[in-house]
Interface confidence: low
């Protein structure tokens, strides 16, 4: 017996209760490929999630994070609270980076300053909570009148944040 389900296009499911007739996916469900025997429930963008793209009969909803949060994981499976540059997110909220570490983004953890001496170089610009140190030439290379580099302008990461 030929499997008639293979003829059912995306946006439908093969309804065994109706002699393998292709039935449209019910509201709030979708099938992104043909030949499906069921439709998948649409993702709900609730709480810290905001709808980026509505669910259709052939594709799942896509979520963003509300202002003050950023996406984590494949297809924005999680929203993590933003912190300021110079901070990291802990279980108790945003905390300033400890001395000797920095974070130049609104996400992620504080990372140690670069150890210039490991590469035989000297510290040209001191690090801060928001910025890594800038390594310069080795102490032996430094001569009077040598010009010093200026630190880069602060990076900005407001992220997608519709108000």
């Amino acid at each position: 017996l030929q499997d008639l389900c293979s003829n059912c296009p995306a946006g439908t499911f093969c309804d065994n209760n109706r002699s393998q007739i292709c039935s449209p996916c019910p509201p709030n469900s979708f099938s992104s490929a043909g030949g499906q025997r069921t439709c998948d429930i649409c993702r709900q963008c609730k709480g810290v999630f905001k709808t980026r793209k509505e669910c259709s009969s052939t594709s799942n909803a896509e979520c963003d994070c509300i202002s003050g949060y950023h996406c984590l994981g494949a297809e924005c499976s999680m929203c993590e609270q933003d912190c300021k540059q110079g901070q990291e997110l802990t279980k108790k909220g945003c905390k300033d980076c400890c001395f000797g570490t920095f974070n130049d983004q609104k996400r992620g953890i504080c990372r140690p300053w670069t150890n210039c001496s490991l590469d035989g170089k000297s510290v040209l610009v001191n690090g801060t909570k928001e910025r890594d140190v800038v390594c310069g030439p080795s102490p032996a290379d430094l001569s009077p009148g040598a010009s010093s580099a200026t630190p880069p302008a602060p990076a900005r990461e407001p992220g997608h944040s519709p108000q």
């Epitope: 793209k53 994070c65 996406c71 994981g73």
Partner: antibody, heavy 121, light 111 residues
Framework: QVQLQQPESELVRPGGSVKLSCKAS????????MDWVKQRHGQGLEWIGN????????NYAEKFKSKATLTVDTSSSTAYMHLSSLTSEDSAVYYC??????????????WGQGTLVTVSA | DIVLTQSPASLPVSLGQRATISCRAS??????????MHWYQQKPGQPPKLLIK???NLESGVPARFSGSGSGTDFTLNIHPVEEEDTATYYC?????????FGGGTKLEIE
Amino acid sequence: QVQLQQPESELVRPGGSVKLSCKASGYTFTSYWMDWVKQRHGQGLEWIGNIYPDSGGTNYAEKFKSKATLTVDTSSSTAYMHLSSLTSEDSAVYYCTREEALGGYYELTYWGQGTLVTVSA
Amino acid sequence: DIVLTQSPASLPVSLGQRATISCRASQSVSTSSYSYMHWYQQKPGQPPKLLIKYASNLESGVPARFSGSGSGTDFTLNIHPVEEEDTATYYCQHSWEIPYTFGGGTKLEIE
């Protein structure tokens, strides 16, 4: 299919302003971010900013915050970019471009043909 | 802002040969799941066209002679074998954070 229609050109006097349009069709206008990109003659691409039509939320590159204002008219599925205090540095092709979605970060999939803005007395 | 440095600025290639374009980001644009780096082709008088998304995913309709690789800060666009119609300027672009930025472009010319 997705289409983004832009006027071919605009001639503006120095110190003046211009409102560029981008009419979208072939998709649900409110569901996708719309971005604007600048390209001076023979130069590279510069991202200006973007707008989410559903909420009117915007993001701008720092250097364009006082130059460009992004708006939308959802009833006509049209995105606009208003450029003010124009100088010769603003003479360029301006593209509107629609984003796709994946995990909160997006690529620029569909592009308009661009509007050539000429600032000249 | 994340700075994208493309090299070379100009790339002469013979027909049928391999073209390799590099794009280096001033910070990582990758997670364990994805690299938020994309490649575009632009021909004179035309808007850019998306070729590769998320470092290595070929956009629909783009010939298989285009491929992308890389993660973290270093990314590569390869074209092999190069054809006449590939004469264009190629740009990398990140979507890791706002503002998005583009590389300076690489002009591919057929020798």
